[in-house]
């Protein structure tokens, strides 16, 4: 029959061409002399001559070497004519199919990749993705299936297991609890995309994971003890700058601290506000403090931070005591 | 023995036609390309084009489609090329050579002995 | 268009020297080459075809090598009958074009 099944022909073949595919035949050969020939892209249209076909034989012939990802498959036309060059049967569909061959290594979309993810977060938070193209076929074979590893982590605190990516998507995730800001701020991860599913060419990109701060840490008092020393009558007079340290990232609402006097200012005598770069505690007197009423306040003031704690925390206290100074007032008649 | 015949010199005038032949024997004419090659005097060698006489089929260099008109006699075994609207340009000696199909990529392995064109006035 | 280059343009050699011609395409043709002889006043005859299979009669002296852009003809030992031009041809999909040969002349 007039009739051709779909011819595959490995990509990359090594010759020698012309390479004999497959023979035309009509069997209108009987009756009269016939001679074959092929149109079509790969023919006799760009890409030309990838195809031809031995006239009088019908022997169709691949001329070079294919390249799948180029071009995957062909569609070529079959014609036979008798001698004195009238078409003896329709032209007939021949379809070319370029197998695959593992000839393309995969390839990161990027050299580096970035992320991020809280401190402290449970095991199996998503932290990024990392993706790998093949070129090959990842369809019909696994040539062009891209499997996902991590080769190595930096720094390996609080050990190298930190972090794992899915075999298949790359989506990378915490796998294990201890992530801290304070003492890893960022890990390396050298990250591998193989393709074979695994078993073939590999490739390595850096996926680096940014520790954003949790407010794990409370500030703190460093003293938790002032002595201080106000003239009485003073309104707005600044009495004691309070210090605290706070281990979460500077500048941030989980290190940025709020004060508040718990106990000692039963008259309302006192306010505290907190310096926008120091971060102290700035105790000033809201009203004049009378010596001959009381010469000695003490109070009791308790920091927190201007965001919430991501975990129960002591809350860090400290003490000033006010010393109210004498001064010589005008008698009152 | 294979063998390519060639006819003999022409002198043509400017602005007419000629017709030179190629007559082959000892092969299967039908089944060979037949290819058509320029030689200008004291110059390199310009495929013209081919034919197949089995079925007729031509293919030509861009350069010569509408100078040069490749056919071919099978009862005969003898191919022709017509040139058309000569002029100096197309002084030259045409040669003829085979090539076989099988392999479909084969190269000239027997030529004619040429063909001198001269145009002039 | 394919373009084929061929270098030396002419080339003067001795009875018994070795030379070599090279070609070169301006796309890959894979081992789709041919070298011819011509002879002054005579027609080209094959020597080398398929890169470098010797066309039937052609002496062992004549050698063909290359692939893909970059051909070259080799003949060992030359003889006074070994003078002429010499052409590189594609045989690989129509049109055919040839180099522009080269003039091998006896020193």
């Known amino acids: 029959d007039w009739v051709v099944a779909p011819i595959s022909v490995p990509e990359n073949g090594k010759g020698p061409f012309p390479q004999r595919l497959n023979q035309l035949k009509s069997n209108k050969d009987r009756d009269t002399k016939i001679f074959y020939s092929i149109t079509g892209p790969g023919a006799d249209s760009p890409p030309e001559g990838v195809f031809a076909v031995e006239k009088e034989t019908g022997w169709l012939l691949l001329n070079k070497p294919l390249d799948r990802e180029e071009i995957a498959k062909y569609e070529l036309f079959g014609h036979a004519v008798s001698e004195n060059g009238a078409s003896v049967e329709d032209p007939m569909n021949i379809s070319i199919i370029v197998t695959d061959q593992n000839d393309h290594k995969p390839k990161f979309t990027q050299d580096t990749f970035r992320g991020s993810v809280l401190e402290g977060v449970m095991p199996g938070t998503s932290v990024m993705q990392v993706t790998a193209t093949d070129e090959d076929d990842a369809v019909n074979t696994y040539n062009g299936v891209v499997a996902y590893s991590i080769h190595s982590q930096e720094p390996k605190e609080p050990h190298d297991l930190m972090f794992t990516i899915h075999k298949s998507t790359g989506t990378i995730s915490v796998i294990s609890s201890g992530l801290d800001r304070e003492k890893v701020p960022e890990y390396r991860l050298t990250v591998q995309a193989t393709d074979m599913d695994g078993e073939g060419s590999t490739t390595t990109a850096e996926a680096v994971v940014q520790i954003l701060d949790a407010n794990d840490n409370a500030p703190e008092f460093d003293p938790q003890k002032y002595e201080a020393h106000v003239p009485e009558n003073a309104v707005g007079h600044e009495v004691q700058r309070l210090t605290v340290t706070d281990l979460d990232a500077p500048n941030s609402p989980a290190w940025r601290a709020t004060y508040l006097i718990m106990g000692g200012d039963d008259g309302d005598h006192f306010t505290i506000t907190t310096h926008p770069e120091s971060n102290q505690g700035i105790l000033t007197t809201r009203k004049g403090l009378d010596f001959e009423a009381k010469n000695q306040h003490t109070l009791y003031v308790e920091v927190t931070n201007e965001a919430p704690f991501v975990l129960k925390l002591p809350t860090s206290t400290a003490t000033i005591v006010v010393h109210v100074e004498d001064v010589n007032e005008a008698p009152v008649f | 023995v294979q063998l390519v015949e060639q006819s003999g010199a022409e002198l043509v005038k400017p602005g007419a036609s000629v017709k030179i032949s190629c007559k082959a024997s000892?092969?299967?004419?039908?089944?060979?390309?037949m290819n058509w090659v320029k030689q200008r005097p004291g110059k390199g060698l310009e495929w013209i084009g081919r034919?197949?006489?089995?079925?007729?089929?031509?293919k030509y260099n861009g350069k010569f489609k509408g100078k040069a008109t490749l056919t071919a006699d099978k009862s005969s075994s003898t191919a022709y090329m017509q040139l058309s609207s000569l002029t100096s340009e197309d002084s030259a000696v045409y040669f003829c050579?085979?090539?076989?199909?099988?392999?479909?990529?084969?190269?000239?392995?027997?030529w004619g002995q040429g063909t001198r064109v001269t145009v002039s006035s | 268009e394919l373009m084929m280059t061929q270098t030396p343009a002419s080339l003067s050699a001795s009875v018994g020297e070795t030379v070599t011609f090279t070609c070169r395409a301006s796309?890959?043709?894979?081992?789709?080459l041919a070298w011819y002889q011509q002879k002054q006043g005579k027609s080209p005859q094959l020597l080398v075809y398929?890169?470098?299979t010797l066309a039937e009669g052609v002496p062992s002296r004549f050698s063909g090598s290359g692939s893909g852009t970059q051909f070259s003809l080799k003949i060992n030992s030359l003889q006074p009958e070994d003078f002429g031009s010499y052409y590189c041809?594609?045989?690989?999909?129509?049109?055919?074009?040839f180099g522009g040969g080269t003039k091998l002349e006896i020193k």
């Open positions: 050579a085979r090539q076989r199909d099988y392999g479909a990529l084969y190269a000239l392995d027997y």
């Open positions: 000892g092969y299967a004419f039908s089944t060979s390309w």
């Open positions: 034919i197949y006489p089995g079925d007729g089929e031509t």
């Open positions: 796309e890959n043709i894979y081992s789709y």
């Open positions: 398929n890169a470098k």
């Open positions: 041809q594609h045989h690989y999909v129509p049109p055919y074009t």
